[in-house]
Every structure is written in C-alpha cells, then in structure tokens.
C-alpha cells in the first residue's frame, strides 16, 4: 500500500505541515506523517538511511494492527508467521510451517495430519460409505432369461473420502453368482435387462455369499466387515470351486 506523505506547505510551527496529504493528521517536511487520521495505521518506512512516517489503511503483510487511544500502529508478526491478527494468532504461516489454532508448528500434533496444500494441521478423516443398495437383477450377458446361472451386483456410495492418513474405503461394488428359474426367452425378450426373476434357493454346495476380492482387501486398510482369515479363504476355494467371487472396487 502506498502511503501519502506530507507536502511542503505553510507551517503551523517549525517542521510541522498543516495540510498533510492523504491519511496523515499531522506531518513534517523531514519525517513525513507524525500521526494518522482515525482507522489508519502509523508505520515507519525506511528510505535509504532515513525513516519516514506513513499512514496505512491496513497493515502490510507480516504485520498486524494494534489500537491505542492516540495512535494505531503496525507491529511485526512472529518470525514463522506470514499474516496474523496478533503475535499469538497467526492466520498464515511461513513456508515449512503448519498452522494449527493460530500457531505455526514444524509438525502436526498427534491425531492430526499435515495438509500440504493449505499448510494446516487438519483432522484425520476416515472413509465413510453408505449402506449397500439392493442387489441388481440376476443376469447373464445382459439378459434375465435363457440361463440357469448368472451374476448379480450391488453397490454403495462413498459419503466421505478419506484424508491421507485416514482409513481407506472398503469395496463399493460386490458381485456374486446367482441362479434363476431356467426360462426360455420369449420373442422380443432376448437381451432385455432389469426384469427380476424369482430366484431358486441355492443348491447344496452353492453359496450366495459375496466374498470381496482378496486383492482389493489387501490394498485397503482392515475394516471389521472386510476381514477374512486367509486360511479360511484357501480352504473355501478348495472345498468348492463353484464358490461365488466378488468383483470389488476399492477407492
């Protein structure tokens, strides 16, 4: 902000100008502003070896305003702080520091993580997902007729994406094998999707349980509903190769 300086004018008494420029209330030829109009801040500006008084509408970056009955002045923020309301309340830290509750920190406290975009310490946010949507109709190659075994899918939405240190999201897609009443497609019905058929109860040794894809489990952080003993998985695969397998998407 450029501040106005006192013009050389008729003097009220030695060295003090009467008609000061801009925001100066009183000024001198040699020292510039000596005092400021209301709501303006007095600051000293160095010009060569000389310090000139200036009146500013707001303090420059790195300084904060303090009010006194006779003068409002600009004071430097702490060394690690770029902008502040006062020395105890920083609003933007210098590079390499993280802002937390008005303070500039080298590292974020326990339970918080550094956001390198905003340079703030923020709460760790864990993934949140919705309830599963209903299973889709049992289909095979997009058809709901003309087959015995098909697949059905269900999905759920991510309500809250996790932050860097947050728990990853569990699978949001699940697919399982299903059986339908064997039925020939009627004329014009071939290829139609979405007509739900009554499903037969699973045959012995045939399961409708959806097992999340083990790869997707390994890539996500353990969440109780996802946890499955690896030995149990192997055992299950050996026992029944027909076992349904889920195609899961991890975010």
């Amino acid at each position: 902000q450029n501040a106005s300086r006192g013009r050389r004018q008729r003097r009220m008494h030695p060295n003090v100008s009467q008609g000061c420029q801009g925001g100066c209330a009183t000024c001198s030829d040699y020292n510039g502003c000596l005092s400021c109009k209301p709501r303006l801040f007095f600051a000293l500006e160095r010009i060569g070896m000389k310090q000139i008084g200036v009146c500013l509408s707001s303090c420059p970056s790195g300084y904060y305003g303090t009010r006194y009955p006779d003068i409002n002045k600009c004071t430097k923020c702490k060394a690690d702080c770029d902008t502040c309301f006062n020395k105890n309340f920083c609003t933007k830290c210098k590079s390499g520091f993280y802002l937390h509750l008005g303070k500039c920190l080298d590292n974020c406290p326990e339970g918080l993580e550094a956001n390198n975009h905003t340079m703030e310490c923020v709460s760790i946010v864990h993934c949140e997902v919705s309830e599963w949507n209903p299973w889709s109709p049992c289909t095979k190659k997009g058809k709901t007729c003309g087959f015995k075994r098909g697949t059905e899918t269900r999905v759920r939405e991510i309500i809250q994406h996790p932050s860097a240190k947050g728990n990853l999201c569990p699978p949001t897609n699940e697919t399982r094998k299903c059986t339908v009443q064997r039925k020939k497609c009627q004329k014009g019905e071939r290829g139609k999707k979405g007509r739900e058929r009554k499903r037969k109860k699973p045959n012995k040794g045939e399961s409708k349980e959806a097992i999340p894809d083990s790869k997707s489990l390994e890539s996500s952080k353990e969440i109780p509903e996802q946890r499955e003993n690896k030995q149990q998985q192997k055992k299950r695969k050996v026992q029944d190769k027909q076992k349904s397998v889920s195609v899961s998407t991890v975010h």
């Epitope: 707001s58 904060y64 009010r67 409002n72 309301f85 006062n86 105890n88 309340f89 509750l101």
Partner: antibody
Framework: QVQLVQSGAEVKKPGASVKVSCKAS????????IHWVRQAPGQGLEWIGY????????GYNQKFKNRVTMTRDTSTSTAYMELSRLRSEDTAVYYC??????????WGQGTTLTVSS | DIQMTQSPSSLSASVGDRVTITCKAS??????????MNWYQQKPGKAPKLLIY???NLESGVPSRFSGSGSGTDFTLTISPVQAEDFATYYC?????????FGAGTKLELK
C-alpha cells in the same frame, strides 16, 4: 459511514445448507477481515471464523471447520458464509463484523436462521 | 480454548448507580504489554456494539461513564453512573488466541 447489510431470514430443513451474505460499504472492502459470529436464541455469542477479502484466505473455529465455507466477491464488496449439514442447534442469528486491530467495531444487522423439520 | 467467565450473569440497578461486571479468562490474554480484551453492549434484537477495546480504551462515541480495567486474566467493566439507556447485556471477548471467545454475558436490569 461504514455499513454491513446482511441478507434476509432463512428457514431450512435439517441436512440442508444455507448461504448468508454481508454487503459492505463506506470503506475499502479489502482493508479489513470480515468475521462471522452467531447467537442462538437467548444465548451468548459464538465466533465462527473469518475471511480476508483482499486474498480470500479464511480460517474457521474448529467446531465449524468441516461445515463452514467463507467466500467473498470483491466486485460487489460482499462476504458470504455458507453452513452445510444444518441441524436444529444451528438455529441462531448470524452476524458479520469488521475486525479492526483485534476488535469487532462494525456489525451487520444479523440474519435469522431457523432449522426445523 | 480460552474460557471467559463473566459474573454476575445478571444484576439489577437503578439509574445513577455504579455497577461493576467482571470477566475472568482461563489463561492470560496479555501479550507484549497489550491486553487483548474487549467489551460489548447488546440490546434486544440488535447487534453488539463495541464499548471498550484493549481492556481499558474507550471506543469513539462511547460515553465516558463506561470504563474498563484489568490485565492478564482478570478484567472489569464499570458503568457509573448508570443511565436508562444502559440497561442491556454486556459481553467480554478475548482476541489473543484462536478461537476468539466471548463470555456468556451479564444482563443489567432495572431494579
């Protein structure tokens, strides 16, 4: 003279969002930070956060951090405060105020928000 | 957070009385010799109005019957003599640290 004029009363359902405006006049909008303070019926004052109109930098009370967003439009000298995922406890009068050297010296007239199903 | 405890929560006075409201901060609100404490007056249905800044400085246009004192954690607002237009709620507020916090208020009522 300095004036802050706020938008009118709002009635919202729980889970909805509200955006309150605060139009400044009588001074250079970018000179002072604008803060938002609320007051629940019959209660005291609670600070929500601030925005620097000069560059748009903002900071919020931790209590509101995940639900509040403060923005500004320098062309119209207007500050905005948006509160999301509203609940009945957010029913209050919301004030904007200029912050001059560590005190709130000018206030808007207040915007009444009622959150009810 | 710095907690601001105001007392009393309400008091009754007559025109001409001297009243004192106190505010105690849970930790010092002073820094570099400055006290970051303000006092506001609020009337029903109106926005708060700044009375005292930096603990003891009278805001421009505020009558001299209002005065503030204190430092560190203990602060006082005094009104003497009380006038009819002074019946309102008074709040202290610290601006030393994030988050900025207010006292719960003191309601001054007509006896």
């Amino acid at each position: 003279q300095v004036q802050l004029v706020q938008s009118g009363a709002e009635v919202k359902k729980p889970g909805a969002s509200v955006k309150v405006s605060c139009k400044a006049s009588g001074y250079t909008f970018t000179d002072y930070s604008i803060h938002w303070v609320r007051q629940a019926p019959g209660q005291g004052l609670e600070w929500i956060g601030y925005i620097y109109p000069s560059n748009g930098d903002s900071g919020y009370n931790q209590k509101f951090k995940n639900r509040v967003t403060m923005t500004r439009d320098t062309s119209t000298s207007t500050a905005y405060m948006e509160l999301s995922r509203l609940r009945s406890e957010d029913t209050a009068v919301y004030y904007c105020a200029t912050y001059f050297a560590n005190n709130f010296d000018y206030w808007g007239q207040g915007t009444t928000l009622t959150v009810s199903s | 957070d710095i907690q601001m405890t105001q007392s009393p929560s309400s008091l009754s006075a007559s025109v001409g009385d001297r009243v004192t409201i106190t505010c105690k901060a849970s930790q010092s609100v002073d820094y570099d010799g400055d006290s970051y404490m303000n006092w506001y007056q609020q009337k029903p249905g109106k926005a708060p109005k700044l009375l005292i800044y930096a603990a003891s400085n009278l805001e421009s246009g505020v009558p001299s019957r209002f005065s503030g004192s204190g430092s560190g954690t203990d602060f006082t607002l005094t009104i003497s003599p009380v006038q009819a237009e002074d019946f309102a709620t008074y709040y202290c507020q610290q601006s030393n640290e994030d988050p900025l916090t207010f006292g719960a208020g003191t309601k001054l009522e007509l006896k």
